[in-house]
Interface confidence: low
């Protein structure tokens, strides 16, 4: 009978860490000599296993390879690696008396796919926080992965957004792959409490896409709105001075009270109001006694946020030499009011 | 042994969007390790490659075509499809449906349908 | 996009003549180029898959060779039923291409 050596698969799909099987038969045993599994062709090509009854990790026949009649030189390769990618091909040789063995019929090879997992998605983003209306760039990135067909898609609080440049490396064959993806995200006030989302779909996945998750609250700056207010005197000698910074992120705020440029008290926040949409508010009381004041003076409210350039508000108060009426006031507009103290 | 079968209407007006349906026989789309394939051919001219879809999702397009298709495949009828938008008399071809291993090549096609863009 | 260039573009041999096409590719492809034959009115047909390998059930006067940027298709014997148009087609970078054919006559 005519020697064929058929390998009936010309490729296999396996996921890392699982066994495939890289089937193998002869229709005769002539003549004698052994079969030899490679990986590769040429000169470089792998000796995979031999069916010497050698010990080889993670390889062993299917079939008996003991018994005189079989013709099944089957493999299974355990916990496959995407370095056990490649073509495999069933070889045999005619064993030779003093001479080495002689390579005289090939299978057509069995390509071996590992089909690798991507890691997980990692979403950067810029070093420093943006403010409203800028323009920032996300970047995701996973790698690992095998086959290189791969689908990534960029979400923003439920909307699809559609990325600057996504690319799968190499660009050409290769045991495993990276890819990379950027998209332009403009902020906005709101988001805050917004996300933007990096979704890896491919085929080890099973349809449960992995996705990476950049928090806006960790890229955003909003500045706050600063407002001072005086409420009405709860006593003849009181004047009560408020300092209002509102929707403001992140946390960190200082507020300094100035008499006519002269710091008069530091107010380190602790108790901010939280709003709906992430954002910060902060109310600073200032009380200050009137019968000391007879002059006009300028009181400066002093808002740092996130180590910004600071915010500055004035509120001019009238000294007592100018009221004609006790107890009156008046309120300009704009940053500066001017109010009387009693 | 797998059969492909394109379907679809053989005259579209200009403008208007291209729709082919490829029916997968004698084998599941969803087993995996191969690329589900649309590929067309201009009246006496050579073969075009359009994209590719596995069965997963993943796709891939030509980019000459890119903003004008879409490829999907619908396991649950063993199916896959081609959309081309905007279409104009240049898109006038032969479209095929294939099967492509990851590397054994167009092993399987459809025989083909003729799409006349034509008002 | 890799460019497949194919020549001739066509030729006319006589039955058992030995007919060679020759694909050549504008970038290293290594071997992953497929070579077809259409028959007029039909659907292509894979021949060679992997430069050099012969598909299941095709004649065996069908031949394919070479790597990298050149690659040679081979009639080793011309019979009646191989009159068709033969195309090479490279997959090693997307978007996948194909030469843009040679026509196979009978003299």
């Known amino acids: 009978k005519e020697l064929k050596v058929t390998q009936p698969e010309k490729s296999v799909s396996v996921a890392a860490g699982d066994s495939t099987v890289l089937n193998c038969t002869l229709t005769s045993l002539l003549p004698v000599g052994p079969i030899r599994w490679y990986r590769g062709v040429g000169p470089s090509r792998l000796l995979i296993y031999s069916f010497a009854g050698e010990y080889v990790p993670r390889i062993r026949n299917v079939s008996d390879t003991t018994k005189r009649n079989n013709m099944d030189f089957s493999i299974r390769i355990s916990n496959v690696t995407p370095a056990d990618a490649g073509i495999y091909y069933c070889v045999k040789f005619q064993k030779g008396s003093s001479e080495p063995d002689t390579e005289i019929q090939s299978g057509g090879g069995t390509e071996v796919y590992v089909l690798a997992k991507p890691s997980p998605p990692e979403v950067s983003g810029p070093a420093d926080r943006g403010i409203p209306d800028q323009k920032v760039n996300f970047t995701c990135k996973s790698h690992g992965f095998s086959p290189r067909n791969i689908t990534l898609k960029w979400f923003k609080d439920g909307q699809e957004l559609h990325p600057l440049e996504t690319t799968v490396n190499p660009s050409g064959k290769n045991v495993s792959y990276n890819i990379s993806s950027t998209v332009r995200v403009v902020l906005n006030s709101m988001d805050v409490n917004s996300k933007v989302i990096c979704e890896v779909a491919h085929i080890t996945l099973d349809r449960s896409p992995l996705r990476g998750i950049a928090n806006l609250s960790n890229f955003i700056r909003v500045s706050p709105t600063v407002k001072v207010t005086q409420q009405s005197p709860t006593s003849m000698n009181q004047v009560n001075l408020t300092c209002r910074a509102e929707r403001f992120y992140p946390e960190d705020l200082q507020l300094i009270w100035l008499e006519n440029g002269n710091v008069s008290r530091n107010d380190t926040p602790k108790n901010l109001t939280k709003n709906t949409d992430g954002t910060y508010n902060y109310t600073s009381l200032f009380l200050v006694n009137s019968s000391a004041h007879r002059e006009d003076v300028v009181f400066t409210c002093q808002v740092k946020h996130d180590q910004q350039p600071a915010i500055t508000r004035n509120h001019t108060v009238l000294g007592f030499a100018h009221s004609s009426d006790q107890g009156s006031m008046q309120t300009f507009p704009d940053n500066n009011a001017t109010h009387n103290w009693n | 042994q797998v059969q492909l079968q394109e379907s679809g209407p053989g005259l579209v007006k200009p403008s208007q969007t291209l729709s082919l349906t490829c029916t997968v026989s004698?084998?599941?789309?969803?087993?995996?390790?191969?690329?589900w394939s649309w590929i067309r051919q201009h009246p006496g001219k050579g073969l075009e490659w359009i994209g590719a879809?596995?069965?997963?999702?993943?796709?891939y397009y030509n980019p000459s075509l890119k903003s004008r298709v879409t490829i999907s495949v619908d396991t649950s009828k063993n199916q896959f499809s081609l959309k081309l938008s905007s279409v104009t008399a240049a898109d006038t071809a032969v479209y095929y449906c294939?099967?492509?291993?990851?590397?054994?090549?167009?092993?399987?096609w459809g025989q083909g349908t003729t799409v006349t863009v034509s008002s | 996009d890799i460019q497949m260039t194919q020549s001739p573009s066509s030729l006319s041999a006589s039955v058992g003549d030995r007919v060679t096409i020759t694909c050549q590719a504008s970038?290293?492809?290594?071997?992953?180029l497929n070579w077809y034959q259409q028959k007029p009115g039909k659907a292509p047909k894979l021949l060679i898959y992997?430069?050099?390998n012969i598909e299941d059930g095709v004649p065996s006067r069908f031949s394919g060779s070479g790597s990298g940027t050149d690659f040679t298709f081979t009639i080793s014997s011309l019979q009646p039923e191989d009159i068709a148009t033969y195309y090479c087609?490279?997959?090693?970078?997307?978007?996948?291409?194909f030469g843009g054919g040679t026509k196979v006559e009978i003299k």
């Open positions: 294939s099967k492509e291993g990851y590397h054994s090549g167009m092993d399987v």
């Open positions: 879809i596995y069965y997963s999702g993943p796709i």
């Open positions: 970038d290293d492809i290594s071997d992953y």
């Open positions: 992997d430069a050099s």
């Open positions: 087609q490279q997959f090693a970078y997307l978007p996948w291409t």
């Open positions: 004698g084998g599941s789309i969803s087993s995996g390790g191969y690329y």
